[in-house]
Interface confidence: low
């Protein structure tokens, strides 16, 4: 095939073209949390396996201290998912007494922080009721989406419960991201 | 556009450039399962529609058997959704007596197989307890992220009940995988 | 490096290639939704924010009276968040009287319109019974999957009930689309 | 409603700096961009720059870069522009509008007089 | 950087006259998102830009009917079908699809 077929001069290009293979990419998997202090209006942030069985970070797109990295500009597609597992929610005497009330909840937010602003930006979050009645409970919360991102910017995990959260398999609990 | 602007002397690429209409992708839908025997310790396999409706394979990702199969090493998104629907979960009378007790539950597994290796791998995991008093129920449980795959590699969606996913319609339990 | 290792001579192409950042693409947030009426038999529709906040349309993926409009025949994957919000579902009290019933539910479905075909086609739904007892509940569906979509083809969301909607922060409730 | 309330006048000597702020109400500030625009007496207006208040990004004119400096609080939905360096040629009236699909809502401006 | 000129710089006109004043880019000023983002403002003496049009012809709330604007890619109109005292002011095209956003010089619609 000629080169033109490749690079045909009458297309529009706005950014150079580059091999799919070479685009920063993570996923990151689930690992035992040590109990950390975390700030009063802040849910907790998960850190992550990044390089042992599914686990992998490529192409300049490196995970630190919870957080990952972003080394280029661009739209990035970003997912979590957090299984969540605990014993009888509180509230269920409360519902067997009949009277409505603010339920148990868990909840997984994704969060950009950029060094250049104090104020993290919440990019998804999903919460969830739970009012089980008598038995132990689990459940995964899935999120993903896509986010124009800034060389620099940081991404991480937050959870209202650090405790719920299932470490047990890398496939139940995990973090990535990949640039479009 | 002059060609350098398209592939810039200094830009390093680790992967040739290629075309993303050539890339292998694949959605399949769900058709009524067969009951078929299943190993003892693994949860049962469910089929796909590969060519009708909203399915589709293209660019030598093949369906074939319950599998999904890789043509070209390289890091593949991989998702998949399962309906379940269900009558008064047997937990219901226990609960009723107010004991804790270990739930019903359901869950997705989308798992990788390599002619190589024996033991399969267990790319992504959903699953969630099941506590419903004195009604029918049903749920989805979806599941998606970024592996890195080799050529030969199958992927299959396992899940815990096959009698309890809802194969009425094609947009709510389906599985797909693409190149990224 | 030399321009035939970005576009080898024996690579087969199927299309011509094309910067990744020129591809389209949308992320639209939730707003507060406006009653409408909405057609008998069909769930009413979401409008959207396209510009505000992390919403954003990119090349040539324009946002219009609730809908996204596909502007180049291809592969994208379309996903979608809501979530719901309720008080005490109905079914309790037929629950508490140990009768099985219809519980109450709630629906996303992403569907596709084509202006030459009258029916529009469902490509992605999320349905799940809601039966709490004695309590407000909160929880998201989520969606996502690739489909093969043609110029001129427009996307919606509609739900079961939009009064069950939160529209309350732009990272519960959002939906979006890029070209692969 | 929609209200962006500037501060006052300001007078002040060559070379000095000043912090000129625009406080917004009647909407969520940190969804939407603050933009800044200069207008000399006389003179027709000139585009600044703009700051989005959620993660603090910017984006300034070549021409003022160096010049100005965009920042907000959003503890108190405020965002504030710093003048440095300052020359009779920055005397002019400063006025903050947001930025939606359009420059909608505009603060009233602050006059800003350089002189010794 | 685009450069945004407007026609005439003075246009003198009678109460209930129609007024056009005309808005030209250096280039076009379709953002790469499809839209065009092109808008008009009348600034009244000693008061701050008010908006009038967004997007090329779309009316702002509140703004009287007899305002419209319409063009495509570099060349823009804005109409008043029938010229009222309350119009009278110097009126701005500005685009905000390339970075720097960028006015126009102005245009001052005063009586006869």
């Known amino acids: 095939l000629k080169g033109q077929e490749f690079a045909p001069s009458h297309q529009q290009v706005y950014a150079p073209l580059r091999a799919d293979g070479d685009k920063p990419r993570a996923h990151l998997t689930v690992v035992r949390q040590t109990p950390t202090q975390h700030l009063k209006n802040q849910f907790p942030a998960l850190h992550w396996e990044h390089e042992l069985g599914l686990a992998f970070t490529k192409n300049r797109m490196n995970y630190t201290n919870k957080f990952l990295l972003i080394p280029e500009s661009g739209d990035y597609f970003v997912y979590s998912q957090v299984t969540f597992r605990g014993m009888t929610s509180e509230c269920s005497e409360i519902r067997q007494a009949g009277r409505p009330n603010k339920p148990d909840s868990i909840t997984v937010v994704i969060t950009k922080v950029t060094d250049s602003y104090p104020e993290p930006t919440q990019l998804l979050m999903g919460t969830k009721s739970v009012c089980e009645v008598g038995s132990n409970w689990f459940q995964p919360i899935y999120l993903g989406a896509m986010f124009s991102l800034q060389e620099g910017d940081k991404l991480m995990v937050n959870v209202s419960d650090i405790s719920l959260v299932d470490y047990t398999k890398e496939d139940k609990t995990f973090f990535g991201a990949f640039l479009l | 556009l002059k060609g350098q602007e398209f592939a810039p002397s200094h830009q390093q690429v680790y992967a040739p450039l290629r075309a993303d209409g050539d890339k292998p992708r694949a959605h399949l839908t769900v058709v009524r399962q067969t009951p078929t025997q299943h190993l003892k310790n693994q949860f049962p396999a469910l089929h796909w529609e590969h060519e009708l409706g909203l399915a589709f394979t293209k660019n030598r990702m093949n369906y074939t058997n319950k599998f999904l199969l890789i043509p070209e090493s390289g890091d593949y998104f991989v998702y998949s959704q399962v309906t379940f629907r269900g009558m008064t979960s047997e937990c219901s009378e226990i609960r009723q007596a107010g004991r804790p007790n270990k739930p019903d539950s359901i869950t997705v597994v989308i798992t990788k197989v390599t002619d190589s290796y024996p033991e399969p791998t267990q790319l992504l995991m959903g699953t969630k307890s099941v506590c419903e008093v004195g009604s029918n129920w049903f749920q989805p449980i979806y599941l998606g992220a970024m592996f890195s795959l080799q050529e030969g590699d199958k992927l299959m969606v396992n899940v815990s009940d096959i009698s309890l996913v809802d194969y009425t319609k094609e947009d709510k339990t389906f599985f797909g995988a693409f190149l990224l | 490096l030399k321009g035939q290792e970005f576009a080898p001579s024996h690579q087969q192409v199927y299309a011509p290639l094309r910067a990744d950042g020129d591809k389209p693409r949308a992320h639209l947030t939730v707003v507060r939704q406006t009653p409408t009426q909405h057609l008998k038999n069909q769930f009413p529709a979401l409008h959207w924010e396209h510009e505000l906040g992390l919403a954003f349309t990119k090349n040539r993926m324009n946002y219009t009276n609730k809908f996204l409009l596909i502007p180049e025949s291809g592969d994208y994957f379309v996903y979608s968040q809501v979530t719901f919000r309720g008080m005490t579902s109905e079914c309790s009290e037929i629950r508490q009287a140990g009768r099985p019933n219809k519980p109450d539910s709630i629906t996303v479905v992403i569907t596709k319109v084509t202006d030459s075909y009258p029916e529009p086609t469902q490509l992605l739904m999320g349905t799940k019974s809601v039966c709490e007892v004695g309590s407000n509940w909160f929880q998201p569906i989520y969606l996502g999957a690739m489909f093969s979509l043609q110029e001129g083809d427009k996307l919606m969301v509609n739900v079961s009930d939009i009064s069950l909607v939160d529209y309350t922060k732009e990272d519960k409730t959002f939906f979006g689309a890029f070209l692969l | 409603q929609v209200q962006l309330q500037q501060s006052g006048p300001e007078l002040v000597k060559p070379g000095a700096s000043v912090k000129l702020s625009c406080k917004a109400s009647?909407?969520?500030?940190?969804?939407?961009?603050i933009n800044w625009v200069k207008q000399r007496p006389g003179q027709g207006l000139e585009w600044i720059g703009w700051?989005?208040?959620?993660?603090?990004?910017?984006n300034y004119n070549e021409k003022f870069k160096g010049k100005a400096t965009l920042t907000v609080d959003t503890s108190s939905s405020t965002a504030y522009m710093d003048l440095h360096s300052l020359t009779s040629e920055d005397s002019a009236v400063y006025f903050c509008?947001?930025?939606?699909?359009?420059?909608?809502?505009w603060g009233q401006g602050t006059t800003l007089t350089v002189s010794s | 950087d685009v450069v945004m000129t407007q026609t005439p710089l003075s246009l003198p006109v009678s109460l209930g006259d129609q007024a056009s004043i005309s808005c030209r880019s250096s280039?076009?000023?379709?953002?790469?998102?499809?839209?065009?983002?092109l808008e008009w403002y009348l600034q009244k003496p000693g008061q701050s830009p008010k908006l009038l049009i967004y997007k090329v012809s779309n009316r702002f709330s509140g703004v009287p009917d007899r305002f419209s604007g319409s063009g495509s890619g570099t060349d823009f109109t804005l109409k008043i079908s029938r010229v009222e005292a309350e119009d009278l002011g110097v009126y701005y095209c500005?685009?905000?699809?390339?970075?720097?956003?960028?006015f126009g010089g102005g245009t001052k619609l005063e009586i006869k």
């Open positions: 700051i989005y208040p959620r993660d603090g990004r910017t």
């Open positions: 509008a947001r930025y939606t699909s359009s420059l909608d809502y």
């Open positions: 009647g909407y969520t500030f940190t969804s939407i961009d």
């Open positions: 500005f685009q905000g699809s390339h970075v720097p956003y960028t």
């Open positions: 280039q076009s000023i379709v953002h790469s998102n499809g839209n065009t983002y």
